[in-house]
Interface confidence: medium
């Protein structure tokens, strides 16, 4: 159905985006966009004088706040005001609707049902995503911020969808993929967060994603120069071949009895206790 602007809305200077509305183009004002905006600030012939400007400040008028409902336009009369009602409304304040479901008043696929009382000739039952007496207003469902943890919201129409930030998942981005809570690492392993997925830092002798796999510490052949590796409850032990020494048999033993250990730090002689 074509949009019905507020009755009397100036076709030259006004426009509407919703039923019963009258929005003014630049340079025009008033409820019907018929009053040109003046550069002068002293237009009003009525009301008390302002001490600061000397201009007449408008007092409250009968049309202030627009007492006319349903898009009616107000005009002042010598005694009070008068409402010019849009098609389908009547009454002192345009509060009575003469529109029926036959007029197709519900927008955006709204379902029209005849009103139960005389003051309401019809009621629009709006589809999801729309509201207003004529289902004319789109509900910004994403403004309710349904996506958690910084997710971006998309209103498809039939449903809301959330585009999650890295490290989060689920319909509302409610699942923290980095979260170690409730994710047990077996055999004394500790959970480490980061990188978009939790991981386990395993105790010696264990490996795998959850530290459930028994690891052979000797599998990587850690003992140098032909040393033999023995798995131990606390890790591994290297039995060095003749002529080598060190935790991994990495240091050769010289014939004169000295070893090729790393040089002592400056200020220390070999054999000195390290304070």
């Amino acid at each position: 159905a074509p949009l019905v602007c507020r009755a009397g809305c100036s076709p030259e200077h006004g426009f509407c985006e919703q039923p019963g509305e009258c929005r003014c183009l630049e340079g025009w004002t008033g409820p019907l966009c018929t009053v040109p905006v003046s550069t002068s600030s002293c237009l009003s012939p009525r009301g008390p004088s302002s001490a600061t400007t000397g201009c007449l400040v408008p007092g409250p008028g009968p049309c202030d706040g627009n007492p006319c409902a349903n898009g009616g336009s107000c005009s002042e009369t010598p005694r009070s005001f008068e409402c010019t009602c849009p098609r389908g409304f009547y009454g002192l304040r345009c509060e009575v609707s003469g529109v029926t479901c036959a007029d197709g008043p519900c927008f955006n696929g709204g379902l029209c049902v005849g009103g139960a009382d005389p003051d309401s000739a019809y009621i629009c039952h709006c589809p999801p995503g729309f509201q207003g007496s004529n289902c004319e207003k789109r509900v910004d469902r994403c403004s309710l911020q349904p996506c958690r943890n910084g997710g971006l919201c998309l209103d498809l129409g039939h449903a809301l969808r959330c585009r999650c930030r890295a490290g989060f998942a689920g319909p509302r981005c409610e699942h923290d993929l980095d979260d170690c809570a409730g994710r047990a690492c077996a055999n004394g392993g500790t959970c480490v967060e980061g990188g978009g997925a939790h991981r386990c830092s395993c105790a010696l002798g264990f490996g795998g994603r959850d530290c459930r796999e028994r690891a052979d510490p000797c599998a990587a052949r850690p003992c140098a120069h032909g040393g033999r590796c023995y798995a131990h409850f606390s890790g591994l032990v290297c039995a060095c071949a003749p002529g080598y020494m060190g935790a991994r048999c990495e240091f050769p033993v010289h014939p004169d009895g000295a070893s090729a250990l790393p040089a002592a730090p400056p200020g220390l002689r070999p054999g000195d206790p390290q304070r």
Partner: antibody
Framework: QSVEESGGRLVTPGTPLTLTCTVS????????MSWVRQAPGKGLEWIGI?????DPYYASWAKGRFTISKTSTTMDLKITSPTTEDTATYFC????????????????????WGPGTLVTVSS | ALVMTQTPSSVSAAVGGTVTINCQAS??????LAWYQQKPGQRPKLLIY???NLESGVPSRFKGSGSGTEYTLTISDLECDDAAIYYC??????????????FGGGTEVVVK
């Protein structure tokens, strides 16, 4: 509830072409709609969607090459500057799905589909 | 980018037999997977949504399963009418900005 495409024809490269998807039995303001194409003898290729509110989203390869828009009863796909690689059958389809998830899962799918309209780009 | 890899590209089985089509997503799509059937010259038809939910009117011979990144479509008691190309599609609105709803490459089912 049905959808149907129209506007497919033979065009020369560079000549803009607009395809139209007409729906009946449901409101375009309540459903997202999608365009999918299929080159002769090839698979299905997703082009983009337009949400119930009128916001279009495109596949990265389709940005700038296609424009999706809609009215109250039709959805359009404009091929801005067709090339021979755009020769295909173009389908429109409605997106259906659950409003809210019961657990950690929800679903979306395309149904119904139109019969398709053939676009041939040749000099 | 989210990529859907379908295997095999073609499979053949006798009437009454069973075929299995696999679909692998390059990231977790949380069971948001749809399967479609397309016969030559026709529009695609929705078979399964949410990885395992059968669309109304589709025979129970079609069964979808899987989770995470691995999904399967199984067609049992094959009929001649099942000869078609089958496509999987991710329906998960993901962090991928390249393609929101990508399809797999398709699997041709030949019924002997």
């Amino acid at each position: 509830q049905s959808v149907e495409e129209s506007g497919g024809r033979l065009v020369t490269p560079g000549t803009p072409l607009t395809l139209t998807c007409t729906v009946s039995g449901f409101s375009l303001s309540r459903y997202a709609m999608s365009w999918v194409r299929q080159a002769p003898g090839k698979g299905l290729e997703w082009i983009g969607i337009i949400t119930g509110g009128g916001d279009p989203y495109y596949a990265s390869w389709a940005k700038g090459r296609f424009t999706i828009s809609k009215t109250s009863t039709t959805m359009d796909l404009k091929i801005t500057s067709p090339t021979t690689e755009d020769t295909a059958t173009y389908f429109c389809a409605r997106m259906i799905g659950s409003e809210y998830a019961s657990s950690s899962e929800y679903y979306d799918a395309f149904d119904p589909w139109g019969p398709g309209t053939l676009v041939t780009v040749s000099s | 980018a989210l990529v859907m890899t379908q295997t095999p590209s073609s499979v053949s089985a006798a009437v009454g037999g069973t075929v299995t089509i696999n679909c692998q997503a390059s990231q977790n799509i949380y069971s948001n997977l749809a399967w479609y059937q397309q016969k030559p010259g026709q529009r695609p038809k929705l078979l399964i949504y949410g990885a395992s939910n059968l669309e109304s009117g589709v025979p129970s011979r079609f069964k979808g399963s899987g989770s995470g990144t691995e999904y399967t479509l199984t067609i049992s008691d094959l009929e001649c009418d099942d000869a078609a190309i089958y496509y999987c599609q991710s329906a998960y609105y993901t962090t991928s900005v390249d393609v929101l709803y990508p399809f797999g490459g398709g699997t041709e089912v030949v019924v002997k």
